[in-house]
């Protein structure tokens, strides 16, 4: 049975440019390693944000990535992205593979709409 | 660009082992999942294996459990299979195929193919 | 394993015409995970169609996917001289990932 990704459709970054979004996908398998992959979308084309493999002992991820955190709990992961900045406005996608055991399943959310807007910086002061 | 080029094809008898290569360029070899698929004359495509990211997970089709293994080497950008125990029924041509960013089982790009033939 | 069955086995069309090619897939567990490719003779394949509908970098618009569940359709709206060859479905929601046998597109 296909795995299927639920995110939220519009999420709006804090002033310091921080998003936060759960990415949760069902049905819960038993799974010993679950890799989670954000995707940005820009026209036609698709990049890597950040990748993580989470397991059972492993539930905090994404330590390579400056700009991506998560915490992995049952089949939800919580997701944060920083550093955004207006350009990096966009949509997200959250990718979930089932790695092991076998068999593999991947899913794929519908993406999360960033809106980021840029702080306007502080008049100065005489 | 994208270019995969394999290698290590031929003419080998029933039972004898072969290993196939794959030299991956144009883009970041570590950051995809591979896949061996092969094609016998006049057939379909059969996937064979694949190797994750990392290394550490490979999924094999059942025809070809136990007796093949897909390997890479990322710092060389090469992926490897090795056969063992060959059957007539394993000649074909053999491709390595990229995962695609989307999903791993998406065959994104192709290299042009190597062809074993298993026969006495 | 998800088992996918590709109709017809041969369509024979003249350029120009509109070609209809059917997948369909044994279970629902492929969802929309449903990839096309082309292949011509002597050449590797190649990825036209993923996500059941959309189109690989640089493919034609003449070429679109459509479907979900079980069954899925590859159009090509009008035949060109370079689109006879063969097409093959693909699932790669789950392993192991399988093909259907395939539908070869010949000149009437």
């Known amino acids: 049975e296909a795995i299927q990704v639920t995110q939220p459709s519009v999420v709006l970054a804090s002033s310091h440019g921080v998003a936060s979004f759960p990415c949760e996908y069902s049905p819960s398998h038993n799974t010993d390693e679950v890799r989670v992959t954000v995707l940005r979308q820009t026209n036609d084309q698709m990049t890597e944000v950040c990748a993580t493999t989470f397991t059972e002992k492993n539930t905090v991820g994404f330590l390579d990535y400056p700009f991506c955190s998560g915490t992995f709990n049952e089949s939800r992961v919580n997701l944060t992205i920083q550093g955004l900045r207006a350009v990096d406005t966009g949509l997200y996608l959250c990718k979930v593979e089932l790695m092991y055991p076998p068999p593999y399943f991947v899913g794929m959310g519908n993406g999360t709409q960033i809106y980021v807007i840029d702080p306007e910086p502080c008049p100065d002061s005489d | 660009q994208v270019q995969l080029v394999e290698s290590g094809g031929g003419v080998v008898q029933p039972g004898r082992s072969l290993r196939l290569s794959c030299a991956a360029s144009?883009?970041?070899?570590?950051?995809?999942?591979m896949h061996w698929v092969r094609q016998a004359p006049g057939k379909g495509l059969e996937w064979v294996a694949v190797?994750?990211?990392?290394?550490?997970?490979?999924y094999y089709a059942d025809s070809v459990k136990g007796r093949f293994t897909i390997s890479r080497d990322n710092s060389k950008n090469t992926l490897y299979l090795q056969m063992y125990s060959l059957r007539a029924e394993d000649t074909a041509v053999y491709y390595c195929?990229?995962?695609?960013?989307?999903?791993?089982?998406?065959?994104?790009?192709w290299g042009q193919g190597t062809l074993v033939t298993v026969s006495s | 394993e998800i088992v996918l069955t590709q109709s017809p086995g041969t369509l024979s069309l003249s350029p120009g015409d509109r070609a209809t090619l059917s997948c369909r897939a044994s279970?629902?567990?492929?969802?929309?995970?449903l990839a096309w490719y082309q292949q011509k003779p002597g050449q590797a394949p190649r990825l036209l169609i993923y996500?059941?509908?959309s189109r690989a970098t640089g493919i034609p618009d003449r070429f679109s996917g459509s479907g979900s569940g079980t069954d899925f359709t590859l159009t090509i709206s009008r035949l060109e001289p370079e689109d006879f060859a063969v097409y093959y479905c693909?699932?790669?929601?789950?392993?192991?990932?399988?093909s259907g046998p395939g539908t070869k597109v010949d000149i009437k």
């Open positions: 190797i994750w990211y990392d290394g550490n997970n490979k």
């Open positions: 144009g883009f970041t070899f570590s950051s995809y999942g």
């Open positions: 279970q629902s567990g492929s969802s929309s995970y």
């Open positions: 195929a990229r995962g695609g960013i989307l999903a791993a089982g998406i065959f994104d790009y």
């Open positions: 693909q699932q790669y929601g789950t392993s192991p990932f399988t």
């Open positions: 996500g059941a509908s």
